[in-house]
Interface confidence: low
């Protein structure tokens, strides 16, 4: 569950697209090694971020809802959660990531195929705000129609980086993998565990680009070792 | 319970043809893409064809692409599969099946005997 | 793409098999383990080269790095004895591939 996660480290307001696209914890899951695979971060692993307390939609980012973190949690106990991609369970527009709205209880693309000008009225059958999938969906989602001809634009499913455009990388979220960007200089980063451990790999980030590298920022060093922040900088 | 049940197998000579259906319950079907893996006797498992959630993209293996046709019918939980040219190497078990990593589900099978 | 399985793999009740699955550049791709029992169709063992669906017994384990993907069964019984398949989305073909798979044989 969720309250197994929530206790961990670090902050909240990343800049896009990292708040909420690794923002964020999710279920808890079993992850690979945390190990950097060459060109790619399929075993990258996460430190996961404190919990950003909300009372409405409108308080967390773009990519965010606010939302009870447990299935049938207090109302009062909200944070603010990763949106739900395409095809996953919803109960409002705003659980859906930007160019999906909630319909039957299902986020779906708000594109011209799917969209006809009305949004339509958000399904009233209570899910209870749980991270799980409709029907037990599986983690990565199953083949669709973006990810396998043009290379994926920021937000497309992917399997792995070379699914992706120049400058994104494929990084897992919430069950799915999805293109995000390399990180630039300045943003927050994963510093990789040594190989064998484990950790949490519901948001993963990307790896820094080129000529940088993921370093424990000097005016963390005074932090525990649970809370250092680590940043791309320079080599 | 999760149930895909599929039909249509049976005895057919060279070169003609033969539709397979999966009927799929307990799930909603319309959310998950669908495959056809086939398994000739005492051989391995051999994918055959996908097909999208929403029927808009559709791939096939090298040794069926052009004679069959993979379908579905989402207001009726069907998924099937168009056999054209049957070929003595297509005899094989039959199986529907999601493939969809923790929601892997498949059926029991149907037998295809292409002889003649 | 191409992977490649070894044909059988033989081991004594209570110690550990290990089933290969070779494939270029195969840890970049997710793997999924199905096992299949005479006349019954493959059940999914591992998925995502290390996830287990919850109904698997944690005996069965995986893992994926480089040019090989490993199943191991620790703790082997006579009733894991069956064929076992590795599978991955090969996106270059836009095609599912199967392993030609492993017989175990619980000695």
């Known amino acids: 569950t969720l309250n197994s996660v929530l206790n961990s480290n670090a902050i909240k307001n990343l800049p896009p697209p990292l708040g909420g696209a690794a923002g964020h914890p999710g279920s808890a899951v079993s992850a690979a090694p945390g190990i950097l695979y060459p060109g790619g971060n399929k075993y990258q692993t996460i430190d996961n971020y404190q919990p950003y307390p909300c009372a409405e939609d409108e308080e967390c980012g773009t990519d965010e809802y606010c939302a009870s973190p447990t299935r049938g949690g207090d109302a009062g106990v909200q944070i603010c959660l990763a949106c739900r991609k395409r095809r996953k369970r919803c109960m409002r527009h705003a659980m859906c990531c930007p160019g999906n709205y909630c319909k039957n209880g299902i986020c779906v693309s708000s594109d011209q195929n799917h969209f006809r000008g009305e949004i339509e009225e958000t399904i009233t059958e209570s899910f209870g705000n749980d991270h799980s999938t409709l029907d037990g969906y599986s983690r990565r989602t199953t083949l669709s129609s973006k990810m396998y001809h043009t290379k994926g634009q920021e937000g497309s499913v992917c399997l792995r980086s070379s699914d992706c455009a120049s400058g994104l990388c494929c990084a897992r979220h919430f069950w799915s993998k999805i293109c995000k960007p390399v990180l630039k200089e300045g943003q927050v980063c994963t510093k990789h565990r040594r190989k064998g451990s484990h950790g949490l790999e519901i948001f993963q980030r990307c790896y820094c680009g080129e000529g940088l590298s993921c370093r424990i920022q000097k005016d963390h060093h005074q932090a525990s070792n649970s809370s250092r922040l680590h940043t791309c900088q320079r080599h | 319970q999760v149930q895909l049940v599929e039909s249509g197998g049976g005895v057919v000579q060279p070169g003609r043809s033969l539709r397979l259906s999966c009927a799929a319950s307990?799930?909603?079907?319309?959310?998950?893409?669908m495959h056809w893996v086939r398994q000739a006797p005492g051989k391995g498992l051999e994918w055959v064809a996908i097909?999208?959630?929403?029927?808009?993209?559709?791939y096939y293996a090298d040794p069926v692409k052009g004679r069959f046709t993979i379908s579905r019918d989402n207001s009726k939980n069907t998924l099937y599969l168009q056999m054209n040219s049957l070929r003595a190497e297509d005899t094989a078990v039959y199986y529907c099946?999601?493939?969809?990593?923790?929601?892997?589900?498949w059926g029991q099978g149907t037998l295809v005997t292409v002889s003649s | 793409y191409v992977l490649t399985q070894p044909p059988s793999v033989s081991v004594a009740p209570g110690q550990t098999a290990r089933i290969t699955c070779g494939g270029n550049n195969i840890g970049s791709k997710s793997v999924h383990w199905y096992q299949q029992k005479p006349g019954q169709a493959p059940v999914l063992v591992v998925y995502?080269?290390?996830d287990r669906p919850s109904e698997i017994p944690e005996r069965f384990s995986g893992s994926n790095s480089g040019n090989t993907a490993t199943l191991t069964i620790s703790r082997v019984e006579a009733g894991d004895e069956a064929d076992y398949y590795c599978?991955?989305?090969?996106?270059?073909?836009?095609?599912?591939?199967f392993g030609g798979g492993t017989r175990l044989t619980v000695l």
């Open positions: 097909i999208f959630y929403d029927g808009s993209n559709k």
């Open positions: 599978q991955v989305w090969d996106s270059s073909s836009d095609h599912v591939v």
């Open positions: 099946a999601t493939l969809a990593a923790a929601f892997d589900y």
């Open positions: 307990g799930f909603t079907f319309s959310r998950y893409d």
């Open positions: 995502d080269d290390s």
